[in-house]
């Protein structure tokens, strides 16, 4: 697993809709793979974390002044949709094929 | 200033190119305002941090399992260019009007 000492990467995060109170409107699935971005953005930032110029600059400033400026953060840079079955306002079960931005596709340093 | 207890926001970060070793190729300016995204992504995530659905989900999971899942992270969501003067391969000082992605325009929770 990606601990504090590991580099920014995508890790598993199973989300149960009951745990977050969304089971009141999402019928299915009961849970899904959301993924989580975990790990540090350490110098030098590798290409696979697709750093922006600002992230590169912030990383270099952090190296010089670690107590003043934070590291860049490992976050989702690309999200994927999931399909959900929910009840519409008429109470009719409806399938939304592309419920956008629910699952991490890629992580990066920002 | 945006400490650990404050909400995600844009704060000042003056970057001196000499400090990060970029003065070898950037002639001017000597320093610039890069800004930094600082502060926490606390529940409930406000509209001004433009949270993605995944960030909302992660925040809710963190509320339920704070030791297992991290909070969303306060990062640049929109960047602005700066203008830089540099020497081209002929040694001619050249102005790049739009050196993209160097300064934070907006911060958000991701």
């Amino acid at each position: 697993s990606a601990g504090a000492g590991s580099h920014c990467q995508k890790t598993s995060l199973r989300v149960n809709f009951e745990d977050i109170g969304w089971d009141s409107w999402i019928i299915a699935p009961k849970e899904y793979e959301a993924y989580e971005c975990k790990g540090g953005c350490f110098f030098p930032l590798a290409d696979d974390v697709t750093p922006t110029k600002h992230a590169i600059v912030q990383t270099l400033v952090h190296l010089k002044f670690p107590t003043k400026v934070g590291k860049a953060c490992c976050v989702p840079t690309k999200l994927s949709p999931i399909s959900v079955l929910y009840k519409d306002d008429m109470g009719v079960p409806t399938l939304k094929y592309h419920y956008e931005g629910m699952s991490v596709a890629e992580c990066g340093c920002r | 200033s945006a400490g650990a207890g404050s909400h995600c926001q844009k704060t000042s970060l003056r970057v001196n190119f000499e400090d990060i070793g970029w003065d070898s190729w950037i002639i001017a300016p000597k320093e610039y305002e890069a800004y930094e995204c600082k502060g926490g992504c606390f529940f409930p995530l406000a509209d001004d941090v433009t949270p993605t659905k995944h960030a909302i989900v992660q925040t809710l999971v963190h509320l339920k399992f704070p030791t297992k899942v991290g909070k969303a992270c306060c990062v640049p969501t929109k960047l602005s260019p700066i203008s830089v003067l540099y020497k081209d391969d002929m040694g001619v000082p050249t102005l790049k009007y739009h050196y993209e992605g160097m300064s934070v325009a907006e911060c958000g929770c991701r």
Epitope: - | S83, L85, V92
Partner: antibody, heavy 118, light 111 residues
Framework: QVQLVQSGAEVKKPGASVKVSCKAS????????MHWVRQAPGQGLEWMGE????????NYNEKFKSRVTMTVDKSISTAYMELSRLRSDDTAVYYC???????????WGQGTLVTVSS | EIVLTQSPATLSLSPGERATLSCRAS??????????MNWFQQKPGQAPRFLIY???NQGSGIPARFSGSGSGTDFTLTISSLQPEDTAVYFC?????????FGGGTKVEIK
């Protein structure tokens, strides 16, 4: 190395035109703007205008706009400055200079003396 | 147009002395955090030579004794230790906007 070689001295009568050439070498001609600057005897430097050899776009000093034409021939890496309706106070050394895109004049030609006399 | 005023008109100093030349602009030459001020050296019978650009940066092959400073409207060219070969006229030039303009020049003489 970069070189700008200008055409020879000219003597012109008032009312005539003069066309000064500037042959560039040692770099890609279309890469930098070409500027023209003149200097009357014992006087300071006066910017006349600039031309982008790549597209032919020009910026002229308002003072010369009605009388000056700047052109290029990319095939022979040469810039030209033509000044019409010459007067005696146009007597000067005319320089071409390569300009960085922020307007600094980095390399200069040797100058062309244009004398306007009746 | 931006007017550049140089002072003094003439500077007469001994070898080894420090020369300070001034150039004042009628409006700020700063943009994007960059000062659009350049300095040129012109010796008799020669074309001008690119000396300093963006207020404080030396052109290629320029000796270290030449330095530039300033921002906004006030700029300075300093020759730390005058050499006989520094006898010349020095011009400032703004490249912030068209028309590019030059100062009237400062003549530096060696006593």
């Amino acid at each position: 190395q970069v070189q700008l070689v200008q055409s020879g001295a000219e003597v012109k009568k008032p009312g005539a035109s003069v066309k000064v050439s500037c042959k560039a070498s040692g770099y890609t001609f279309t890469r930098y703007w070409m500027h023209w600057v003149r200097q009357a005897p014992g006087q300071g430097l006066e910017w006349m205008g600039e031309i982008n050899p790549s597209q032919g776009g020009t910026n002229y000093n308002e003072k010369f706009k009605s009388r000056v034409t700047m052109t290029v021939d990319k095939s022979i890496s040469t810039a030209y400055m033509e000044l019409s309706r010459l007067r005696s106070d146009d007597t000067a050394v005319y320089y071409c200079a390569i300009g960085a895109n922020y307007g600094g004049l980095v390399y200069w030609g040797q100058g062309t003396l244009v004398t306007v006399s009746s | 147009e931006i007017v550049l005023t140089q002072s003094p008109a003439t500077l007469s100093l001994s070898p080894g002395e420090r020369a300070t030349l001034s150039c004042r602009a009628s409006e700020s030459l700063d943009n994007y955090g960059i000062s659009f001020m350049n300095w040129f050296q012109q010796k008799p019978g020669q074309a001008p030579r690119f000396l300093i650009y963006a207020a404080s940066n030396q052109g290629s092959g320029i000796p270290a004794r030449f330095s530039g400073s300033g921002s906004g409207t006030d700029f300075t060219l300093t020759i730390s230790s005058l050499q006989p070969e520094d006898t010349a006229v020095y011009f400032c030039q703004q490249s912030k906007e068209v028309p590019r303009t030059f100062g009237g020049g400062t003549k530096v003489e060696i006593k």
